[in-house]
């Protein structure tokens, strides 16, 4: 197909957007989401991890949470760390609409951020050393 | 503070970072909390392909390789930002969207005695 | 908006079996881990079977192991849940929920729930 051909059958309401940007609506849709945050599994997890709040103003949302794994191994039903397992970071992908300064001009830009979103506890693959 | 609606560039910064869990890493198969992946699809929204996790066991899985239910496997859930095609079918034209998933499983104490 | 409808419920005599079923609509079954819960006249409600995500994997209170069955068909978006050698003691109100983190899902995160369906057991 032709370059910028789109899978999408193009509305006859669709607004006009200048080439090579795209309308954005920032307010966003299912603000409120079911989601518990009393349940503490980042500390009851055997793959316990700390969360870190980054900010930028420049950015939206400009409050990103990024999680940091406590231990290299896992914690036993002991209580101790087992470091013949692996605590490591689950991660996701997420947008985010970055503001950006150009003299007097502002430009947005639409960016993908990678979230450490907890850990778990994964047994190790064996590098045997030559 | 972020005007409502605003003219983004069309190209995404970062783009192309590996989108597969299943090609980055194994670990849904190495956890003792594993899991499955689902493959959610949706061609209103960007991006278009997103990979749901399931916990694959209500306990999670101890050193003989048995399922251990003093233990719980729970989903880690994140809400992430996505675009949604507004109006419909339209190519350039997206609002936020923020949808909640589930990127993997870690295994915790329980604190629900629901088990004898 | 999620519903879920309870039925199968009914009159059973001492050793007896029902097969409950839940219909749940506005929530597909397959994403979460599903339970069955009950609640007898004065008394809290409690947990009585889960089941997983993938749905190969299920859980038992104490009280019902070896009794009862719980399973699901994510296809017609259905829970059931077997009862067979059925005691007064389960009489009682049988709800279902989703279960939307497994076993640690808290009673007190419950944001809704079903009519249920009565059961009950006489001797």
């Known amino acids: 197909g032709s370059e910028g051909e789109t899978f999408f059958q193009k509305p006859e309401s669709c607004p006009p957007v200048p080439g090579g940007s795209m309308k954005l609506d920032i307010g966003i849709i299912n603000e409120n989401q079911r989601v518990s945050m009393s349940r503490n599994i980042e500390s009851r997890s055997t793959s316990p991890w700390d969360y870190t709040v980054t900010w930028d103003p420049n950015r939206y949302p400009s409050e990103v949470v990024q999680a940091q794994c406590r231990n290299l191994g896992c914690i036993n039903a002991q209580g101790k760390e087992d470091i013949s397992m692996n605590s490591v970071p689950i991660q996701q992908e997420t947008l985010v609409v970055r503001r950006k300064h150009q003299g007097s001009s502002v430009s947005f830009q639409l960016e993908k951020v990678l979230v450490t979103v907890g850990c778990t506890c994964v047994t190790p693959v064996i590098h045997h050393v030559q | 503070n972020f005007p409502r609606t605003v003219m983004v560039n069309l190209n995404i910064h970062n783009r192309n970072t590996n989108t597969n869990p299943k090609r980055s890493s194994d670990y849904y198969d190495r956890s003792t909390s594993p899991w499955n992946l689902h493959r959610n699809e949706d061609p209103e929204r960007y991006p278009s392909v997103i990979w749901e996790a399931k916990c694959r066991h209500l306990g999670c899985i101890n050193a003989d390789g048995n399922v251990d239910y003093h233990m719980n496997s729970v989903p880690i859930q994140q809400e992430i930002l996505v675009l949604r095609r507004e109006p419909p079918h339209c190519p350039n034209s997206f609002r936020l969207e923020k949808i909640l998933v589930s990127v993997g499983c870690t295994c915790v104490t329980p604190i629900v005695h629901h088990v004898a | 908006q999620v519903q879920l409808v309870e039925s199968g419920g009914g009159l059973v005599q001492v050793g007896g079996s029902l097969r409950l079923s839940c219909e749940v609509s506005?929530?597909?079954?397959?994403?979460?881990?599903m339970g069955w819960f009950r609640q007898a006249p004065e008394k809290e409600r409690e947990f009585v079977a889960a089941i997983s995500w993938i749905g190969g994997d299920s859980r038992y209170a104490h009280f019902v192991k070896g009794r009862f069955t719980i399973s699901r068909d994510n296809a017609k978006n259905t829970v059931h849940l077997q009862m067979d050698s059925l005691k007064p003691e389960d009489t009682a109100v049988y709800y279902c929920?989703?279960?939307?983190?497994?076993?640690?899902?808290?009673?007190?995160?419950?944001?809704?729930w079903g009519l249920g369906t009565q059961v009950t057991v006489s001797s």
């Open positions: 506005g929530l597909p079954v397959s994403s979460y881990a």
């Open positions: 929920n989703d279960m939307p983190y497994g076993l640690d899902t808290r009673m007190d995160e419950y944001e809704y």
